[in-house]
């Protein structure tokens, strides 16, 4: 990793060992400079591998609401609007960081957690398994 | 939102106002229970809207390395392996939470930050704009 010179104005931290507890300001700074209002908004419907978004809510997690994509079909939509099963719809997944309340129900104490979420779907050429 | 009964064993928190500072344990718990070994590993290459992954590194951010997808083509790959410009490759984007060192270079003090990342690409039917 990269060694960062320590800023002398940093808050004191008692715990120098892992598991490391740090201070986090929850006042979110939004760095999304992308001004395109469309973003992925209607891609779920226009894609050749369309998907639906399902709301996943967990009050013990921050953020408490995450949207999960589920591919509508196993195949992909062709030019005629029909499902073509010679191609496969597959989920595009990403590992994201969330905060999990720990101990449970505590408003000011969290643990970082990695979860795998499905963001959308893409159409791929199938893997052909050749039988010997 | 959902009201969570406070656990009496929670750590004390001095700052009751926003911006709210909380304690976060950085010892990451991995909750990925999905047993599908494939995940998105080779989809970037097999997709009809293939993408390349670019490493985005920032030592002031946690996680410091994020992979960004960039679609290889404006169009999509057809059955003959050629780019079809009657269809569009578009990035699937997601807002994720990261931790930004604040003040800068501090190992134990962060602020939550929302950033927009491209996770992969999908092939969509273009929006046709009719000229009056």
């Amino acid at each position: 990793g990269i060694t960062i010179p320590r800023n002398p104005g940093c808050p004191n931290s008692e715990d120098k060992n892992f598991p490391r507890t740090v201070m986090v300001n929850l006042n979110i700074h939004n760095r999304n400079t992308n001004t395109n209002p469309k973003r992925s908004s209607d891609y779920y419907n226009r894609s050749t591998s369309p998907w639906n978004l399902h709301r996943n809510e967990d009050p013990e997690r921050y953020p408490s609401v995450i949207w999960e994509a589920k591919c509508r079909h196993l195949g992909c939509i062709n030019a005629d609007g029909n499902v073509d099963y010679h191609m496969n719809s597959v989920p595009i997944q990403q590992e994201i960081l969330v905060l999990r309340r720990e101990p449970p129900h505590c408003p000011n104490s969290f643990r970082l957690e990695k979860i795998l979420v499905s963001v959308g779907c893409t159409c791929v050429t199938p893997i052909v398994h050749h039988v010997a | 939102g959902i009201t969570i009964p406070r656990n009496p064993g929670c750590p004390n928190s001095e700052d009751k106002n926003f911006p709210r500072t909380v304690m976060v344990n950085l010892n990451i718990h991995n909750r990925n229970t999905n047993t599908n070994p494939k995940r998105s590993s080779d989809y970037y290459n097999r997709s009809t809207s293939p993408w390349n992954l670019h490493r985005n590194e920032d030592p002031e951010r946690y996680p410091s390395v994020i992979w960004e997808a960039k679609c290889r083509h404006l169009g999509c790959i057809n059955a003959d392996g050629n780019v079809d410009y009657h269809m569009n490759s578009v990035p699937i984007q997601q807002e994720i939470l990261v931790l930004r060192r604040e003040p800068p270079h501090c190992p134990n003090s962060f602020r939550l930050e929302k950033i927009l990342v491209s996770v992969g690409c999908t092939c969509v039917t273009p929006i046709v704009h009719h000229v009056a």
């Epitope: 639906n52 994509a69 589920k70 509508r72 079909h73 196993l74 989920p91 893997i127 | -």
Partner: antibody, heavy 124, light 113 residues
């Protein structure tokens, strides 16, 4: 407790439109998709179509030109409309919930909860 | 459309004895991306709606007794009841959940001898 209940007229005249309602309780509409399935007397089951949790639809091509499935989230109700009916549309009509499985990234097209069914007879 | 063919169409059984129903699909139900077979089994008891027994060929639905088991891959599938009980009578349907439109077998009527 998950419940689905179909309702609507038991008798429809040929060439008219069959209209049925499915009232659901015990599960969240934004999470689940619902399908309509029918069973002609003494015969097997036939999938008619689905309305997904976000409101999109997909229909069996055998019915495509004359079927409409819609949802009224405020009333927890789904509806089926089948136009230009004939005697061949006489059947027990079921609404059924498409199974929802966490950590599985495809919509499911098998059905884990069914209504009790309603018999619709097409006759003049 | 995918044709699902069940056999036998009628199955007289003796309580306590095993029973087996076959289901054949006109196309493979194996999805190469996750190696799942998209086949489900239902039981429709007399005067009732169908109830889901098994999905993805062999996964038992919650609350279904373990005397029911499913097996098979590709185009050939089997539902087995290890020891038939009186409450197992009714019509059993297989259903493919891979290709649209999603189709059912014609049903196998299981009755006590």
């Amino acid at each position: 407790q998950v419940q689905l209940q179909e309702s609507g007229p038991g008798l429809v005249k040929p060439s008219e439109t069959l209209s049925l309602t499915c009232t659901v309780s015990g599960f969240s509409l934004p999470s689940h998709s619902v399908s309509w399935i029918r069973q002609p007397p003494g015969k097997g089951l036939e999938w008619i179509g689905i309305i997904w949790n976000q409101g999109g639809t997909d229909y069996n091509s055998a019915f495509k030109s004359r079927v409409t499935i819609s949802v009224d989230t405020s009333k927890n109700q789904f509806s089926l409309k089948l136009s230009s009916v004939t005697a061949a549309d006489t059947a027990v009509y079921y609404c059924a919930r498409n199974a929802y499985i966490t950590d599985y990234y495809y919509e499911n097209y098998f059905f884990d909860a069914w209504g009790q069914g309603t018999l619709v007879t097409v006759s003049s | 459309d995918i044709v699902m063919t069940q056999s036998p169409l009628s199955l007289p059984v003796t309580p306590g004895e095993p029973a087996s129903i076959s289901c054949k699909s006109s196309q493979s139900l194996l999805f190469s991306e996750n190696q799942k077979n998209y086949l489900a089994w239902y039981l429709q008891k007399p005067g009732q709606s169908p109830q889901l027994l098994i999905y993805w060929t062999s996964t038992r639905q919650s609350g279904v007794p373990d005397r029911f088991s499913g097996s098979g891959s590709g185009t050939d599938f089997t539902l087995k009841i290890s020891r038939v009980e009186a409450e197992d009578v009714g019509v059993y349907y297989c259903q493919q959940s891979y290709y649209t439109p999603y189709t059912f077998g014609q049903g196998t009527k299981v009755e006590i001898k």
